[in-house]
Amino acid sequence: TQNKALPENVKYGIVLDAGSSHTSLYIYKWPAEKENDTGVVHQVEECRVKGPGISKFVQKVNEIGIYLTDCMERAREVIPRSQHQETPVYLGATAGMRLLRMESEELADRVLDVVERSLSNYPFDFQGARIITGQEEGAYGWITINYLLGKFSQKTRWFSIVPYETNNQETFGALDLGGASTQVTFVPQNQTIESPDNALQFRLYGKDYNVYTHSFLCYGKDQALWQKLAKDIQVASNEILRDPCFHPGYKKVVNVSDLYKTPCTKRFEMTLPFQQFEIQGIGNYQQCHQSILELFNTSYCPYSQCAFNGIFLPPLQGDFGAFSAFYFVMKFLNLTSEKVSQEKVTEMMKKFCAQPWEEIKTSYAGVKEKYLSEYCFSGTYILSLLLQGYHFTADSWEHIHFIGKIQGSDAGWTLGYMLNLTNMIPAEQPLSTPLSHSTYV
């Protein structure tokens, strides 16, 4: 007689990351009997939803159901049918929806309502859609990377599971860059966190962590670009904006109404004598860098030290994982290697931005022009944010690790979010027999 394989005792979870520019669905899997152990949850699927972020559906909410269909059907295929009803589904919306809520709470509620109605029709255990705070986004990103790096494990290993693992229990800081916000989260060295809003206390696996976090709304790469354009058009003499952050020969027409649509440009809003203007690229890294620095107000700081805009930032400490758009942009620019110094990155950016647009289009024929055109700005913005915004130096640059995936799981807030909501991060170190689910973050 043939031996029948026992069904594997696994669990699944789904998290949708409803970002400002797009939505991604992540499917996680873990052994049911080991759910209190650290490092056992891993990503088995990522599905990128075709289309923009959910905040863009405010005038066409009837299309939300169709928008989510492909990825939800993919989840139906990947997860065994017998597990569907036990599989929790969470949707977290980030800064794009925070901005929409600032404009109109009613419109944000309408979008979330239709998202929830659509997701509730699937056979999973839908646990709701909500706008997560910037503080949560930072905290869950920090939990994700440290969980995946094995930093919460009390067992010291003789081998390294990831290239940048330093084999000690010092946690990594987390640097997250989205389209509409950016987060910085780390454990400062014996430093009091001077602003309570930026302080988090965790007890994870029997150890206490005092964590600093801040989310800069409007300082994601897309909103930062809108801010820069709104600032620069103020001083343009006519409807032509000669922009150093775009390649020489690049041209694009921008509607003033689009420019002022976001709350992020309100501070630069003025009555202009034209409805449209044309960006004309001149491709100059240094000038682009200078223009970006004007977005950071460093003249005011009510604390011992600040990042920018009067926000407290303790001295940087330890290694940092830089993920999401930090990684995607630097990966495109081929600048993620540990061996590339900050000076080298700056040199490469100078060369890249100076390349003519026609040449760039030929070299990267497979890349959508909308994205391709913005890599010069995005790369320069990343350097400006890390160096002038967060005060990394040429020396501390080597402590930044541009991370896409760790152990096959994407770096980002979604895994940490699910671990918390499914009570899989115990406050105390689990014994060999599982503890009751009573003491969690």
Partner: antibody, heavy 121, light 107 residues
């Protein structure tokens, strides 16, 4: 003053379908969601599904999925609930109810008078 | 789905007395809880939403409290028209779910 006016009582055979209507009179209809809630004799309330007429977005309780269809006609300010493959356990009063708002405001601030559906051979 | 449990199933109270009805959710619903009153042969009527906000036209003797998983509806001084069945409903997550009801009867 908005009112939800429901269609009259129905007697149906097992295996057949029933379609109950709910017309909003005296106010706006489209932008509010309409839910259908049923109550079997001497029992509690059971939510079946919901629709936002303006968006055409419907969602259903898993228990009824595949057997219930909720639609709306904006032009007549009417919502419909069709339940198929009827069985004796579907004998109940079927209410339409207006949801007060979006997202976390899904409580019912206005109810129809109910439609008794009897399933009997 | 979230299971709503009401207790007691029946509450016998004399007119003028206070009635306290309980509702428990199987998981947190924050403050997304509503209470309804239903009299025989009638549709339910909204009393309370958001756990503690009285609906339009509802007398002050009706009050709601609680958050998370434990909720209470209090009728401070029962009037003859208050003898009815009371239902709680969570409005946090789909599917929307109701408790089994508490019948408030004359003692």
């Amino acid at each position: 003053q908005v009112q939800l006016v429901q269609s009259g009582a129905e007697v149906k055979k097992p295996g057949s379908s029933v379609k109950v209507s709910c017309k909003a009179s005296g106010g706006t209809f489209s932008s509010y969601a309409i839910s259908w809630v049923r109550q079997a004799p001497g029992q509690g309330l059971e939510w079946m599904g919901s629709i936002i007429p303006i968006f055409g977005t419907a969602n259903y309780a898993q228990k009824f999925q595949g057997r219930v269809t909720i639609t709306a006609d904006e032009s007549t300010s009417t919502a419909y609930m069709e339940l198929s493959s009827l069985r004796s356990e579907d004998t109940a009063v079927y209410y339409c109810a207006r949801e007060a708002g979006y997202y976390r405001y899904r409580y019912f601030d206005l109810w129809g008078r109910g439609t008794l559906v009897t399933v009997s051979s | 789905e979230i299971v709503m449990t009401q207790s007691p199933a029946t509450l016998s109270v004399s007119p003028g007395e206070r009635a306290t009805l309980s509702c428990r959710a199987s998981q947190s619903v924050s403050s997304n809880l509503a209470w309804y009153q239903q009299k025989p042969g009638q549709a339910p009527r909204l009393l309370i939403y958001g756990a503690s906000t009285r609906a339009t036209g509802i007398p002050a003797r009706f009050s709601g409290s609680g958050s998370g998983t434990e909720f209470t509806l209090t009728i401070s001084s029962l009037q003859s028209e208050d003898f009815a069945v009371y239902y709680c409903q969570q409005h946090a997550l789909w599917p929307l779910t109701f408790g089994g009801g508490t019948k408030v009867e004359i003692k």
